[in-house]
């Protein structure tokens, strides 16, 4: 399978497990979490950076806390620096992480899928029309 | 091939100790997480341990947590598994299994166990 | 925690049926946290779907996953004499089982 077959299953992934995580918000710390929304074009992987960065935990309530420390382990699992540096040229100007608007855990994730799935179309996207700027 | 073995299995009385080793090859072993799962006699599947690819960290099933403790080697592809403590109720067959999916970007990504061992017997009694 | 159920705890076909088998648990689950695994006597597990739907390496599309939330199904489209075994369902992350659903020949 081509690597950027790989790349696009891992994505995809990154969704079921917010989606996982979305089951148990009630067991998340009710933490607000700067959690980038309308990302401007070229600084997706810096917004997805600030995701990974943010301090999702689990309230330590007993139940499923097993499945959401996997969970949360997994969603912040790093790309290879190909990925996340294409936009390297872009980042300086790319907003930093303190600087997006705090959001509770239930709403934290929403964003995270929406710039999941925005970074999903954007590779498809790029690969139909043949660019190799994904 | 890739491969699991495991080791250290036997008959060991109420309140001792043992300790499982599960040889692996064939693969990066590094790069995966690890699992004990455990069947006793005539019953079901039963997840026993967990421990991240690096080591970084581990989940136990409630009916071990205190008693048993998962390891691994890196360096010698080895995995562990010393259990303390030991119960009449511990009695069963212990398989190591590999995590389905890699630490690696590109490498596999199967939310499940794909790779499992033969088996080791432990038999708890007086 | 979560708790699968399987049913039926038995199921006796005959080669060249179809098997539906039953896994439905207490609790959503996203797809990708869906396992199904093959047990014959004697010998370990081996993986035959992942991600509630993906067959893992080298298993026959006789097996095929299906399913969402809480209920999930793995169906063998044509017995056949290698099939009969027991089959458990499993939750990724918390790694809970199923109790198992034994297919037997009839």
């Known amino acids: 399978m081509q690597g950027q077959d790989r790349h696009m299953i891992r994505m995809r992934q990154l969704i079921d497990i917010v989606d996982q995580l979305k089951n148990y918000v009630n067991d998340l710390v009710p933490e607000f979490l700067p959690a980038p929304e309308d990302v401007e074009t070229n600084c997706e992987w810096s917004a997805f950076s600030c995701f990974q960065k943010a301090q999702l935990k689990s309230a330590n309530t007993g139940n499923n806390e097993r499945i959401i420390n996997v969970s949360i382990k997994k969603l912040k699992r790093k790309p290879p620096s190909t990925n996340a540096g294409r936009r390297q040229k872009h980042r300086l100007t790319c907003p930093s992480c303190d600087s997006y608007e705090k959001k509770p855990p239930k709403e934290f994730l929403e964003r995270f899928k929406s710039l999941l799935q925005k970074m999903i179309h954007q590779h498809l996207s790029s690969r139909t029309h043949g660019s190799e700027d994904s | 091939q890739v491969q699991l073995v495991e080791s250290g299995g036997g008959v060991v009385q109420p309140g001792r100790s043992l300790r499982l080793s599960c040889a692996a090859s064939?693969?990066?072993?590094?790069?995966?997480?690890m699992h004990w799962v455990r069947q006793a006699p005539g019953k079901g599947l039963e997840w026993v341990a967990f421990?991240?690819?690096?080591?970084?960290?581990?989940y136990y099933a409630d009916s071990v947590k205190g008693r048993f403790t998962i390891s691994r080697d890196n360096s010698k592809n080895t995995l562990y598994l010393q259990m303390n403590s030991l119960r009449a109720e511990d009695t069963a067959v212990y398989y190591c299994?590999?995590?389905?999916?890699?630490?690696?970007?590109?490498?596999?990504?199967?939310?499940?166990?794909?790779?499992w061992g033969q088996g080791t017997t432990v038999t708890v009694s007086s | 925690e979560i708790v699968l159920t399987q049913s039926p705890g038995t199921l006796s076909l005959s080669p060249g049926e179809r098997a539906t088998l039953s896994c439905r648990a207490s609790?959503?689950?996203?797809?990708?946290?869906l396992a199904w695994y093959q047990q014959k006597p004697g010998q370990a597990p081996r993986l035959l779907i992942y991600g509630a739907t993906s067959r893992a390496t080298g298993i026959p599309d006789r097996f095929s996953g299906s399913g969402s939330g809480t209920d999930f199904t793995l169906t063998i489209s044509r017995l056949e004499p290698e099939d009969f075994a027991v089959y458990y369902c499993q939750q990724y992350g918390s790694w809970t089982f199923g109790q198992g659903t034994k297919v037997e020949i009839k």
């Open positions: 299994a590999r995590d389905g999916d890699s630490s690696d970007w590109y490498g596999d990504y199967y939310f499940g166990m794909d790779v």
């Open positions: 064939g693969f990066t072993f590094s790069s995966y997480g």
């Open positions: 609790q959503s689950v996203s797809s990708s946290y």
């Open positions: 421990i991240w690819y690096d080591g970084s960290d581990k």
